[in-house]
């Protein structure tokens, strides 16, 4: 069961796995959630009744019964990990901790104007986990405005002490705010010969790369495949680092693969979710349970629903015994990875999907694209919404995209003449406008946030957020789309689609069925040539065929320009403006979403 509230003056007795230091109970809960085995924790706050050496300790705990006896203790705060919860979770921590010195290895010291600048430096430094900044009121003159970048083996401080006039905080890499280069290449037949910080077993290089990404010290990895000559090293995933952050030596070796941590590509790719099945593969580990199951998919479900299960092996039924049910072995280990991987025994193995909620919901797989037709099918564009106005009569006003469970991203120009959010209704999971009846459920709009530099669509800043009155429960037919990551600014998207219920030609009517068109992106320079009388800025992006024929049109405004990259859909553009519809040499102009990611995060994460 999911318990989110913290228990004040309460300590859980026993079950200790390890102790770390965190600046708050809230962050202790996050650390527990991300730890492979932690189910409960006890945090000690600062208190005159407590020994200062125990302040800020976060004891991570496990229990076979998923609970532990409670004891009253002043200054102790206890709680449960979010593993037991179905809601989305994130390691992103933007809090700044005043008068706290978070200890670690101080590997870089420089002058900074503010704590924010120091945090940005930490976020853009490959090794930095957290920082401490001495403010201009700091007693020691020569230390004022000094920004100390720090790292540790665990990514959490080795100790936390009270220190006046300093502030501390964490890198925002896990908030997808790093400008560090995102290197997605996996290099075949390559070994990176740098120091290993850890090693785990993995079924393939992709899982190895994801493990590297969420390991605090790993910057790159080498994976030995199952064909690697040295048997004892097969399926071994070596997690590596170096002083420069880059591999210093690269050796050509057959049957090895190497790659990089994807920490700077964070929000656009799944990092925790290992959803594949591995056939003729057995994962070894501590056995949690053996259950009968009809299929390997059913076995994965059982593992996902058992909070302590980390991975499984399914052995299919022999002939007709046990009603055609096979054996599902639910397993765990100290680090969440199999202790050994064996091949050729007929098992089918995989991982719990419980960790998928640690990834952005938008990265999870959706229905495959239906190629060819212009009409969409249900669930094909689950982030697409239809925004209706009820005044003077109810009608489709604009498109929009779900980007969070309470947020729709759309165009600012949609709200010309809209006096109040009360007249707006957002319908999600809709394929045909005719489905919308009097009793069709909708989301009311609590707030319309229009970019404060918006004047008119053609001059840019054509972007708006709608805050919904209630939250969207994600299903196959309504789920978010990923925002492009700042680290992906240079990705060249080749699979882009515009969708909407808008006109199919300039003088037309709103379509009943959601329409789709695959449209190539056009460089801003090319676009500028087509719109001599306008300024095409870098905050705009253009798409269209030279010969015309496919384009967004009236009624599609505010809807998405969705591009698929590395199997994940990104909201690259918001339908904004254009000259006519689908005219020759007149591409559609879209709001370039990547340029507004900071604005979106600022507005959606404001307290």
């Amino acid at each position: 069961e999911c318990v989110t509230q913290l228990l004040k003056d309460t300590c859980f007795e026993g079950g200790d796995i390890t102790t770390v230091f965190t600046p708050s109970a809230k962050y202790c809960q996050v650390v527990c959630t991300y730890h492979p085995r932690c189910l409960l924790f006890t945090f000690t706050a600062e208190s005159p009744s407590e020994d200062p050496t125990r302040w800020f300790t976060c004891v991570l705990k496990d229990s076979v019964t998923e609970t532990l006896p409670r004891v009253n203790r002043t200054a102790a705060i206890s709680g449960y990990s979010f593993k037991q919860c179905s809601h989305q979770i994130s390691a992103c921590n933007k809090d700044i901790y005043v008068d706290l010195d978070m200890k670690g290895i101080n590997y870089n010291s420089s002058v900074a104007k503010s704590a924010q600048e120091c945090q940005e430096r930490c976020t853009d430094d490959v090794h930095c986990h957290f920082f401490t900044y001495a403010t201009r009121q700091f007693p020691s003159l020569e230390h004022r405005n000094i920004c100390l970048l720090k790292h540790t083996q665990t990514g959490t401080p080795t100790r936390i002490t009270k220190l006046d006039k300093v502030v501390s905080g964490f890198s925002l890499k896990s908030c997808a705010l790093s400008n560090l280069a995102c290197i997605r290449d996996i290099f075949p037949n390559t070994v990176f010969a740098d120091s290993n910080i850890d090693s785990v077993m993995a079924p393939d290089a992709f899982v190895c790369g994801r493990i590297c990404t969420h390991h605090p010290g790993c910057l790159f990895f080498t994976f030995f495949s199952q064909e690697w000559p040295k048997e004892s090293q097969r399926n071994l995933c070596l997690l590596k680092t170096s002083e420069s952050g880059l591999p210093s030596t690269r050796i050509k070796k057959s049957k090895a693969l190497s790659g990089f941590s994807l920490q700077s590509c964070r929000h656009s790719i799944p990092v925790f979710c290992h959803s594949s099945f591995y056939h003729d593969t057995d994962f070894l580990g501590e056995e949690l349970d053996i259950v009968a199951a009809k299929s390997h998919e059913a076995c994965q479900k059982l593992c996902t629903n058992a909070v302590r299960c980390q991975f499984f092996t399914y052995t299919p039924a022999q002939a007709s015994c046990n009603e055609g049910k096979g054996k599902c072995y639910l397993k765990l280990s100290s680090n969440g990875s199999p202790t050994k991987i064996l091949h050729g025994r007929g098992g089918i193995s995989g991982y719990t999907l419980r960790l998928c909620k640690m990834d952005n919901e938008c990265t999870t797989k959706i229905k495959p694209r239906i190629v060819g037709g212009t009409a969409s099918v249900r669930g094909e564009w689950p982030w697409q919404v239809t925004l209706h106005t009820t005044s003077p009569t109810q009608r489709h006003l604009c498109g929009g995209s779900i980007i969070g469970n309470q947020w729709i991203l759309t165009a600012a120009h949609c709200f010309y003449g809209v006096e109040s959010p009360k007249i707006l209704r957002v319908y999600s999971g809709i394929l045909n406008q005719s489905e919308i009846k009097e009793d069709t459920s909708f989301f009311g709009v609590q707030e319309i946030i229009i970019h404060d530099q918006y004047k008119m669509a053609e001059s840019g800043y054509d972007i708006a957020l709608l805050k919904l009155e209630t939250t969207v429960n994600y299903t196959d037919s309504q789920r978010p789309i990923c925002l492009p990551s700042k680290g992906d600014r240079n990705v060249i998207y080749t699979d882009c689609w515009v969708t909407g219920w808008g006109y199919r030609k300039l003088r037309d009517k709103i379509q009943n069925t959601l329409q789709k068109a695959k449209i190539p992106l056009v460089t801003n320079e090319e676009c500028q040539k087509r719109y001599r009388g306008h300024k095409i800025t870098h905050k705009m992006i253009c798409a269209g065929y030279r010969e015309g024929g496919k384009d967004a049109c009236k009624g599609d405004s505010g809807g998405p320009l969705s591009c698929k990259h590395n199997e994940v859909w990104h909201l690259v553009g918001i339908t904004s403006w254009g000259e006519g519809c689908a005219q020759r040499e007149r591409p559609g102009v879209y709001t370039n979403v990547v340029e507004y990611v900071d604005w979106i995060l600022e507005k959606t994460q404001a307290v």
Epitope: D124, A181, C182, D185, F187, S244, G245, L246
Partner: nanobody, 124 residues
Framework: QVQLVESGGGSVQAGGSLRLSCAAS????????VGWFRQAPGKGLEGVSA????????YYADSVKGRFTISRDNSKNTLYLQMNSLKPEDTAVYYC?????????????????WGQGTLVTVSS
């Protein structure tokens, strides 16, 4: 001693092309971030393009995307910048730079080694 030497600058009409080269000695492009930066008269340094030479991942400033192409020849330890459809606003001194750490690719503050620069003048 590390030396980066740029060449290929010059004067060109708007719409024309130039190819800049940067030859390195004492520093290997292979397995590092290398990039081109520019400084227009009276302006600050601006990141133009960068490449991670191991895999060839490339990065471009929005103002040059689609017009400029960065490439490198690891065997010759040389970096190139092919500049097409040049505009008057591309007029600047172009510098080649090499990093020795994993960096934000277009952030000049994080690059260690720099060339002397080559002047590119685009007239309308």
């Amino acid at each position: 001693q590390v030396q980066l030497v740029e060449s290929g600058g010059g004067s060109v009409q708007a719409g024309g092309s130039l190819r800049l080269s940067c030859a390195a000695s004492g520093y290997t492009f292979n397995n590092n971030f290398v990039g081109w930066f520019r400084q227009a008269p009276g302006k600050g340094l601006e990141g133009v393009s960068a490449i991670y030479s191991l895999g060839g991942s490339t990065y471009y400033a929005d103002s040059v995307k689609g017009r400029f192409t960065i490439s490198r020849d690891n065997s010759k330890n040389t970096l190139y910048l092919q500049m097409n459809s040049l505009k008057p606003e591309d007029t600047a001194v172009y510098y080649c730079a090499g990093a020795i750490t994993w960096v934000p690719p277009l952030s000049h503050r994080r690059y260690t080694y720099w060339g002397q620069g080559t002047l590119v003048t685009v007239s309308s």
